[in-house]
């Protein structure tokens, strides 16, 4: 707390300006009025104030607005946002896009603060849902933005967002995050014709099921080594070689580098020997011929 | 009176890891933002990453992104820099700095970090 | 990024002579400049901050001015313990940025 102390003769401040960065911590307590710094907000961020003296402002307009800043105020915060702590934040109702932005835009660069991240939560619930503009704005400032939500938290994107994904924002995404997203994307993308779909739902595929890639594989669409090993295991495993060959088109011959790496290692396994010497890439660890195959799966289905 | 004791810097090999320390006194390092420049032989002063007071707002510059993580003990009035996957452009004086906003207004004495096979 | 670039890179110049080096940023920065002195060997010190705002214990004959895109600092009457090289700092934005510096010699 800043000692309250009388305003020296003189000193009493008529507007913000740059005259306030030569005022000492108790000259700018005593001598800016809290409504006018709340009026002329959208000078702060042009004057070179230390963090010292931003403290001093944030505890004026605390002391002014004890429920939370209106947004007239939020939307000028500039750095002064760096001196927020979540416990402020989340006492603010912040509705437009554009102030969301601006905050945003003080963080860029930045990692992904508490700050911000309550600031995003604030606003996504605030708004119902994740639309596409939030979502757009979002990603555009941390494209990892879409991986750091919970499967439950996505599951309220509507399809209709995930035109507003670019591949890099699925980077970090785990199979339980792809696996709520996939399901959109094919929704979003349905009426795309065969290869403008598969370009589109290249990046969620790590969420699709088996039935899907055997689809895929009837679509001569090439798919390449990199998202073939971001696909689901239990996904793959069900893949012929014949299915694996036309979904791989020419970057079948991959898998031979990829050989003790899931999901291909894995595969392997499940496939027959003479079905993967087809492929004439040298790939070992098939059934031998003659063996019998249970698919214990299916017996537990039916017992 | 403030000051600032860098340590850790040496000698490393290109990929390798190394991590810095700050020690602070003086002055109430809980209060304070703290930031890390460097300066390659010869060169001129380079910005790089600092963290907040309470340690929840980082920034790196786009030529450590990735490779190093500031971070600090307010109990123990430290700041830190881990160097991962160390590059030969990476030699150079690393200080550390207290970050007012506007300036720094105090540095450390800087210590000598060379990678080189 | 924002772009520091000082003028001249260096400069010869005598006791007693007035010093004058120049910062322009690549953008309106407004105010947010500071200027620091670096001996060999040392580490930079603070000199002015705020563009013109003279830091407690520095010698009056550095001063500072400008805002914008343009900056000055000058040394009214050189000291022999001024030769060194001296940097100016944008904080305007993320990162913040350097100039390349000015050496101060002996003429």
């Known amino acids: 707390e800043v000692e309250k102390t009388a305003c020296p003769s003189g000193k009493k401040a008529r507007e913000i300006d740059e005259s306030l960065i030569f005022y000492k911590k108790w000259e700018l307590e005593a001598c800016v009025d809290a409504a006018l710094l709340a009026t002329q907000m959208d000078r702060v961020n042009a004057i070179p104030f230390t963090y010292e003296q931003l403290d001093v402002l944030k505890h004026k307009l605390d002391e002014l607005y004890p429920q939370g800043y209106p947004e007239s105020v939020i939307q000028h915060l500039g750095y002064l946002f760096l001196k927020m702590s979540p416990e402020d934040i989340r006492k603010w109702n912040v509705t437009s896009l554009e102030t969301l932005k601006a905050l945003l835009e003080v963080n860029k660069g930045h990692e992904m603060s508490p700050q911000v991240a309550t600031l995003i939560d604030r606003f996504v619930k605030g708004r119902g849902q994740l639309d596409k503009d939030t979502l757009d704005t979002l990603t555009a400032f941390y494209p990892g933005y879409l991986c750091s939500l919970s499967p439950e938290e996505l599951s309220s994107v509507p399809p209709s967002s995930i035109w507003a994904v670019r591949p890099q924002d699925l980077d970090t995404c785990d199979p339980r995050q792809l696996d709520v997203l996939y399901p959109k994307a094919r929704l979003a993308f349905q009426n795309m014709n065969g290869s403008e779909y598969f370009v589109k739902i290249q990046s969620f595929l790590g969420g699709a099921p088996t039935e899907d890639l055997k689809a895929l594989s009837q679509q001569n669409v090439s798919m390449d080594l990199a998202t073939f090993m971001k696909l689901r295991t239990d996904a793959v495993l069900p893949l012929t070689v014949a299915e694996v060959q036309k979904l791989l088109g020419p970057h079948v011959e991959g898998l031979k580098a990829e050989e003790r790496h899931r999901p291909v290692r894995d595969w392997i396994l499940r496939q027959r020997q003479d079905d993967l010497d087809t492929l004439g890439l040298g790939l070992q660890g098939g059934i031998p011929n003659g063996y019998l195959v249970l698919d214990l799966s299916m017996q537990e289905a039916l017992s | 009176q403030v000051q600032l004791v860098e340590s850790g810097g040496g000698l490393v090999k290109p990929g390798g890891s190394l991590r810095l320390s700050c020690a602070a006194s003086g002055f109430t390092f809980s209060d304070h933002y703290m930031s890390w420049i460097r300066q390659a032989p010869g060169k001129g002063l380079e910005w790089f990453s600092y963290?907040?007071?309470?340690?929840?707002?980082?920034y790196y510059a786009d030529s450590v992104k990735g490779r190093f993580t500031i971070s600090r003990d307010n109990a123990k009035n430290s700041l830190y820099l881990q160097m991962n996957s160390l590059r030969a452009e990476d030699t150079a004086v690393y200080y550390c700095?207290?970050?007012?906003?506007?300036?720094?207004?105090?540095w450390g004495q800087g210590t000598l970090v060379t990678v080189s096979s | 990024d924002i772009q520091m670039t000082q003028s001249p890179s260096s400069v010869s110049a005598s006791v007693g002579d007035r010093v004058t080096i120049t910062c322009r940023a690549s953008q309106d920065i407004s105010r947010w400049l500071a200027w620091y002195q670096q001996k060999p060997g040392k580490a930079p010190k603070l000199l002015i901050s705020a563009a013109s705002r003279l830091q407690s214990g520095v010698p009056s004959r550095f001063s500072g001015s400008g805002s914008g895109t343009d900056f000055t600092l000058t040394i009214s009457s050189l000291q022999p313990e001024d030769f060194a090289i001296y940097y100016c700092?944008?904080?305007?934005?993320?990162?913040?940025?350097f100039g390349q510096g000015t050496k101060v010699e002996i003429k």
């Open positions: 700095a207290r970050d007012v906003g506007s300036h720094f207004d105090y």
């Open positions: 700092q944008q904080a305007k934005s993320f990162p913040r940025t």
């Open positions: 963290i907040s007071s309470s340690g929840g707002i980082i």
